[in-house]
């Protein structure tokens, strides 16, 4: 019958950053196509990426409906040129994904330093609040809206003339740090969810920003 030459997908992997979530799998298709289904533990299966020759499927629209749910996906393999027929009873080969809980597992995207302002021996460093595709009443929510006090930022700062780094932490998006007058400093920030116990607890470091460049402002 029609599915005997198809190969089940394997290595199903979730790739997710700031809730932008893509399911990837293997193999690259030869004479076959794929359809993905996703569901919550208690919900119905919903089909996505119908009869695709790709080996990835963007499931963001589904998971952002409730980022605190746990999701399962499965990938069905069909012969190339397959057309859904009402008379077909044979289930195509498929493979299940690992479970995925976006709130606990999405990676934190690389943060950005929005600005810094020096007033005397104090510098205020502001981290840009990243937007996500999670919505509330048709409004997109920021990372801070979703994670609240679960999300903190770590600031690394050092004198341009030396390599010794200092750190500061905030559960807002702002740091107020003491600096030596007349010295230029460089800054980098990292997003952290302290309640996580896994490798996705921290983001990568932001690009380094240094005083004396356009993001900064100095007032005596």
């Amino acid at each position: 019958s029609g599915t005997t030459n198809t190969v089940a997908a394997y290595n199903l992997t979730w790739k997710s950053t700031n809730f932008k979530t893509i399911l990837e799998w293997e193999p690259k298709p030869i004479n076959q196509v794929y359809t993905v289904q996703i569901s919550t533990k208690s919900g119905d299966w919903k089909s996505k990426c119908f009869y695709t020759a790709d080996t990835e499927c963007d499931l963001t629209d589904e998971i952002v409906k409730d980022v605190k749910q746990t999701y399962l996906a499965r990938v069905f393999s069909y012969p190339a040129g397959h057309v859904e027929s009402t008379g077909s009873t044979e289930e195509p080969p498929y493979e299940n994904s690992p479970e995925f809980t976006p709130y606990l597992e999405t990676n934190l995207g690389q943060p950005t330093i929005q600005s810094f302002e020096q007033v005397g021996t104090k510098v205020n460093v502001t981290v840009q609040d990243e937007w996500t595709l999670v919505r509330r009443n048709d409004t997109f929510l920021s990372l801070r809206d979703v994670f609240g006090k679960d999300l903190i930022y770590t600031l690394y700062y050092w004198k341009s003339s030396s390599s010794g780094k200092k750190t500061a932490k905030t559960n807002t998006n702002e740091f107020l740090i003491d600096v030596d007058k007349g010295e230029n400093y460089c800054f980098s920030v990292q997003a952290v969810i302290p309640s996580r116990r896994t490798a996705n607890r921290k983001s990568t470091d932001s690009p380094v920003e240094c005083m004396g460049h356009e993001k900064g402002e100095s007032r005596e």
């Epitope: 533990k41 409730d66 605190k68 749910q69 746990t70 809980t101 709130y103 606990l104 502001t126 981290v127 609040d129 509330r136 929510l141 920021s142 990372l143 801070r144 809206d145 979703v146 994670f147 609240g148 006090k149 679960d150 999300l151 559960n171 807002t172 998006n173 702002e174 302290p194 309640s195 996580r196 116990r197 896994t198």
Partner: antibody
Framework: EVQLVQSGAEVKKPGESLRISCKGS????????IEWVRQMPGKGLEWMGD????????NYNENFKGHVTISADKSISTAYLQWSSLKASDTAMYYC?????????????WGQGTLVTVSS | DIVMTQSPDSLAVSLGERATINCKSS????????????LTWYQQKPGQPPKLLIY???TRESGVPDRFSGSGSGTDFTLTISSLQAEDVAVYYC?????????FGQGTKLEIK
Amino acid sequence: EVQLVQSGAEVKKPGESLRISCKGSGYTFITYWIEWVRQMPGKGLEWMGDILPGSGSTNYNENFKGHVTISADKSISTAYLQWSSLKASDTAMYYCARSGYYGNSGFAYWGQGTLVTVSS
Amino acid sequence: DIVMTQSPDSLAVSLGERATINCKSSQSLLSSGNQKNYLTWYQQKPGQPPKLLIYWASTRESGVPDRFSGSGSGTDFTLTISSLQAEDVAVYYCQNDYTYPLTFGQGTKLEIK
């Protein structure tokens, strides 16, 4: 329907140990913080601490740290508040509550409360 | 720790009249990242657990009657009941939901005059 069901009232003597429970249902237990709140007779609300069952991460109010332990068993969707040695001053109503869906959006659901009486 | 102070401690208002409860925090509850104030209001009736009314200082929880409204920013907040009903008799608490430790105001007892 989201529900938090707490264990029944307890009467204990000073120095005894106690564990009270809070069972969550109707939602994904691992992704919401469970909060514990004390209310002494005729008094206001005091936040004791919380736990995120998915990771076991906890936060405590310094006023309660070392005196109570917060834990959770995600396999049975239950959070616990325990004392190793009760004092008469622990006599109070204890509530568990679940955090809201959005960040910092309050304690959206509450258990019915567990009354703990400690008396010699 | 952030200290939450409510005023008045008790309040008597006639049915159908406006009731106003104030809450002051010792530090700002405004999150610079998203410009939200992490101030929450609860209602507690005798013998019952508290009930969430308002979060983010002004967002009504689902199912809460629209006579309840919250306002304010930074350190000064207000809960307003536009037209008091008999079932609104309760103790009202504000809460810092901004940073640990989470702290409550001492409560305001609302009664019918």
